[in-house]
Interface confidence: medium
């Protein structure tokens, strides 16, 4: 028992929010201001992320967890953990290296970020265009022309609901 205890790393007893202080006989010291340790047994605390400028603080740093940032209005997060802020564009635009550009005819973007995507090709599904697309909105596909022939229902009946967890028969 004594031998096992002497082999055990004394730092392993230091909980999150502290570090094992070599300068003080390996006692557990609290993380200094603006630093944190998210796991036990740490020999140092990590510096808190600072959300400056175009970044703003979403969650304050604590002794056990890093700060989390998001972006100031007019920008949106990119990358893991919001590592970058990218400029918003208007709906109907996409961001290029030249700046925000209107979507080309036949494409749309209904968000302030991302790229312009082609309108849905209704005819691929045998449907017709019910509502034309715009730079901001996709086309709305309606029933195929055949479905609109006299006597045909203009509403497609819903497919039978499947029980969750069951494969289609």
């Amino acid at each position: 028992f004594e031998r096992t205890r002497s082999l055990q790393d004394p730092c392993s007893n230091c909980p999150a929010g502290t570090f094992c202080d070599n300068n003080r006989n390996q006692i557990c010291s609290p993380c200094p201001p603006n630093s944190f340790s998210s796991a036990g047994g740490q020999r140092t605390c990590d510096i808190c992320r600072q959300c400056k400028g175009v970044f703003r603080t979403r969650k304050e740093c604590s002794s056990t967890s890093n700060a989390e940032c998001d972006c100031t209005p007019g920008f949106h997060c990119l990358g893991a953990g919001c590592s970058m802020c990218e400029q918003d564009c208007k709906q109907g635009q996409e961001l290029t290296k030249k700046g925000c550009k209107d979507c080309c005819f036949g494409t749309f973007n209904d968000q302030k970020r991302g790229i312009c995507r082609p309108w849905t090709n209704c005819s691929l599904d045998g449907k017709s265009v019910l509502v034309n697309g715009t730079k901001e909105r996709d086309v709305v596909c309606g029933p195929s022309p055949a479905d609109l022939s006299p006597g045909a229902s203009s509403v497609t009946p819903p497919a039978p609901a499947r029980e969750p967890g069951h494969s289609p028969q």
């Epitope: 400056k52 400028g53 175009v54 100031t72 209005p73 007019g74 920008f75 990119l78 970058m84 802020c85 990218e86 400029q87 918003d88 961001l95 290029t96 290296k97 030249k98 700046g99 925000c100």
Partner: antibody, heavy 123, light 107 residues
Framework: EVQLVQSGAEVKKPGESLKISCKVS????????IGWVRQMPGKGLEWMGI????????RYSPSFQGQVTISADKSISTAYLQWHTLKASDTAMYYC????????????????WGQGTLVTVSS | DIQMTQSPSSLSASVGDRVTITCRAS??????LNWYQQKPGKAPKLLIY???SLQSGVPSRFSGSGSGTDFTLTISSLQPEDFATYYC?????????FGQGTKVEIK
Amino acid sequence: EVQLVQSGAEVKKPGESLKISCKVSGYSFTNYWIGWVRQMPGKGLEWMGIIYPGDSDTRYSPSFQGQVTISADKSISTAYLQWHTLKASDTAMYYCARHQGYSFSGSHIDDYWGQGTLVTVSS
Amino acid sequence: DIQMTQSPSSLSASVGDRVTITCRASQSISSYLNWYQQKPGKAPKLLIYAASSLQSGVPSRFSGSGSGTDFTLTISSLQPEDFATYYCQQSYSTPPTFGQGTKVEIK
């Protein structure tokens, strides 16, 4: 090092034409907008227009549309501001500036400026 | 065009003073607001972009805040080299427009 070096001061008469230049170095000329800003004596800053040298796309402030022409020569990394018919009211300092646009770090901003070209139009 | 209004148009201050300049936009410009410093006979220099982001190499005594229509440039402790004219600029829409400038003079 990014540098924008403008042509020297000009003294002209009303009715004459003029083309001033802004030669850039230290970055890819075709990848950034270049803007022109006017500052009349003792006055504030006025944005005139910008050009994207990569494809010569040009945008003007309505106040300067038709009054000046902005152009660029990719082969010598130089942007130009031109007047066909100068007026006394064109007397001002003119600055070119790299338009650090649409970056991941911020909004469209002018982060590097030329030293300015003083244009004096007087009879 | 979006109108930018700065106040005051001029102010006198002493070295070490805290100085605040405000800028108001005629419509919401989100965070698309830049601050420039200009000294006599020199080109403007970018200080702050996106309302509150400090441009690389600019001393930390300069700070910016605000969003929407109301913005502030603060110099926490005025230094001799800070006596200059300061301009705000909106870059939300074309054409980007500048405020009329605030001249910071020695008291």
